[in-house]
């Protein structure tokens, strides 16, 4: 038995103190308007369908419908007592998409269609989504619409995030195969892209793929191995979308950040988290030769988004995703370091001293020590009588070294009046000087040789 305490319907006149289900009249198998409770809330009856009259005489509206008097006021006990008839109107007024791929003006119409379908022994129609079929739900007042700020950031920055792929040559066939990939982001409309130095290491061919699927060959413009930042360039007609650099110095622990990358063509990977620490020393992290500070975040950084941007909620780059140390702890190179790198790179290129151009003379050499000299002398009777300098292992054909007259087994003992003790001394002078006046020990002769280094792409 039902107690009236549980009833949702307003108490109507003439209702029994206790509901007795046995006294309820039998109901038809199918109800056009769906089932509803009678005015007393005791018995299940057939509800009036949408648009049908409702009120005291006519009975209740079906499921999801409410009885509304012509003035738009929902029928109450008072209305009923006045015996004023209302109309059954759907409580929900927005369109819905049904599983039968039809759009219904409201939920009640979908329910009615579902009842008809079941009557014909077909599957019921269920709600697939709010809004018309094939149309996104764009309710500006929905929570999803109001609070998905991460998705908003991603939408804003994604076009400027690129996929980078490196290729190597097979040893004999010389066919190129992919060897590694990473991400990067565009910083200038004419195609300058920032990524990690470790992403574009060595003499690999670098291919860049944009969000729209267009692919380009990239040239390495500048690299800072220590800071792990590289600048590459693609030649693109027209303006490219760019990301702006924020101030990493103004970052606060607890700020939301988004790490985005492009590990596969035409796809982005997004992780999010907060800034844990704004300045973690590289030495602290056990990174070799790094005295740089890193941004620590719990946003997951992995091979897929390495080289991509770490952005704040304004879509400004505050770091380059760089490495994952342990689960839940990742690090990014601060944007202030990127700014410094880009400024210095611009200066170098303006002065024609970009790291892209490497000075080269075409020798392989090693530092000569007294023990190495003794060993070589034992092996070659005519080896020069020297105990330090740069010993030439190999002179590469068609290079400045060969043109200048350097030969294998020569020992460079001075360049431009400065004595040479090690191979490093030679490397340093090559970087600095445009002409190398060398004194070379060959057998037991000292020979003067002039070599003009050439500039090559690294």
């Amino acid at each position: 038995q039902l107690s009236r305490a549980g009833r949702s319907a307003p108490l109507a006149a003439g209702c029994p103190d206790r509901c007795e289900p046995a006294r309820c009249p039998p109901q038809p198998e199918h109800c056009e308007g769906g089932r509803a409770r009678d005015a007393c809330g005791c018995c299940e009856v057939c509800g009036a369908p949408e648009g049908a009259a409702c009120g005291l005489q006519e009975g209740p509206c079906g499921e999801g419908l409410q009885c509304v008097v012509p003035f738009g006021v929902p029928a109450s006990a008072t209305v009923r007592r006045r015996a004023q008839a209302g109309l059954c109107v759907c409580a929900s007024s927005e369109p819905v998409c049904g599983s039968d791929a039809n759009t219904y003006a409201n939920l009640c119409q979908l329910r009615a269609a579902s009842r008809r379908s079941e009557r014909l022994h077909r599957p019921p129609v269920i709600v697939l989504q709010r809004g018309a079929c094939g149309q996104g739900q764009e309710d500006p007042n929905s929570l999803r619409h109001k609070y998905n700020f991460i998705a908003d950031v991603v939408e804003k920055i994604a076009p400027a995030v690129v996929h980078i792929e490196l290729f190597r040559k097979l040893p004999f066939s010389k066919r190129e195969v992919p060897v590694a990939s990473g991400s990067g982001f565009i910083v200038s409309e004419d195609g300058l892209i920032v990524t990690n130095a470790h992403v574009v290491t060595n003499k690999h061919r670098v291919k860049v793929e944009l969000k729209n699927g267009a692919t380009y060959e990239a040239k390495i413009k500048d690299v800072d191995e220590k800071a792990d930042i590289a600048l590459i360039k693609i030649d693109h007609q027209g303006k490219l979308p760019v990301l702006l650099l924020g101030r990493s110095s103004e970052l606060r622990p607890g700020e939301f950040v988004v790490a985005i990358g492009s590990p596969f063509s035409l796809q982005n990977t997004v992780t999010t988290g907060i800034v844990s620490t704004t300045q973690r020393g590289g030495k602290e992290l056990g990174l070799r030769n790094s005295d740089m500070d890193y941004i620590q975040t719990d946003a997951i950084i992995n091979y897929g988004n390495s080289g991509g941007p770490l952005v704040n909620l304004d879509g400004e780059v505050i770091g380059i995703n760089t490495l994952k140390v342990t689960a839940g702890i990742s690090f990014a190179i601060p944007s202030d370091k990127i700014k410094k790198f880009l400024t210095e790179s611009h200066d170098r290129q303006a002065k024609g001293k970009a790291i892209t151009k490497k000075k080269y003379i075409g020798i392989r050499m090693m530092s000569l020590t007294s023990s190495k000299a003794k060993e070589l002398k034992d092996r070659h009777r005519d080896f020069p009588d020297v105990i330090s300098g740069a010993y030439i292992i190999e002179v590469i054909p068609d290079t400045p070294a060969e043109a200048g007259g350097l030969k294998e087994n020569d020992v460079i003992i001075s360049i431009n009046g400065q004595s040479v003790v090690s191979a490093n001394d030679v490397s340093d002078v090559i970087k600095r000087e445009s002409t190398l006046n060398m004194v070379v020990r060959r057998g037991n002769e000292d020979i003067m040789i002039t070599v003009i280094p050439e500039e090559i792409d690294p």
Epitope: L170, P171, R175, V177, V179, A180, T201, E394
Partner: antibody, heavy 123, light 105 residues
Framework: QVQLVQSGAEVKKPGASVKVSCKAS????????MHWVRQAPGQRLEWMGA????????AYNQKFKGRVTITADKSASTAYMELSSLRSEDTAVYYC????????????????WGQGTLVTVSS | DIQMTQSPSSLSASVGDRVTITCSVS?????MYWYQQKPGKAPKLLIY???NLASGVPSRFSGSGSGTDFTFTISSLQPEDIATYYC????????FGQGTKLEIK
Amino acid sequence: QVQLVQSGAEVKKPGASVKVSCKASGYTFTDYEMHWVRQAPGQRLEWMGAIDPETGGTAYNQKFKGRVTITADKSASTAYMELSSLRSEDTAVYYCTREGYSYEGGGYYFDYWGQGTLVTVSS
Amino acid sequence: DIQMTQSPSSLSASVGDRVTITCSVSSSVSYMYWYQQKPGKAPKLLIYDTSNLASGVPSRFSGSGSGTDFTFTISSLQPEDIATYYCQQWTSYPTFGQGTKLEIK
């Protein structure tokens, strides 16, 4: 994980030919060259040749040129080495080995090897 | 052709000893590679690019050198290190040293 599984031992008569197979798994077969290296009893390892499984392009050690043929079946991820006009000094263990590549230095080496196939040439 | 000379061809050492093997090439090479081969087994890469340890190889193994002279070292010999060791270069095509057979005293 990367695995190279070779066919079983063979006994051949002088003048005959032998064909050894090498089934690769655990990596993209066409992204690496497959090489063949042999080792005669008490001798050093000796490189015979290589194939690019994608294109079928080959390279051979001059010493074996004309006697060795390396082929590959992409669909089966299998490489083959056939040595003809066998002589007693071809008695050796024949290995297939994948070309490895150093991302840092750009150097080449052999990173994975088959278990070896003993070919005995005897009359 | 590049000639490779590995020395010694065999050596006997005690557990815990420091063991050094050298490899000389007839003309300069960029890198040297070192392999370990146990009886009845295929060679196993230990050192790549002259001095880099291959994945899963114990740190007691190391390599050094440049140009024409290269060295392979086991800092503290262990019983499981008994094997033959080969050096390998790859300039125009791969060639191997004749091997060094290492035994326990």
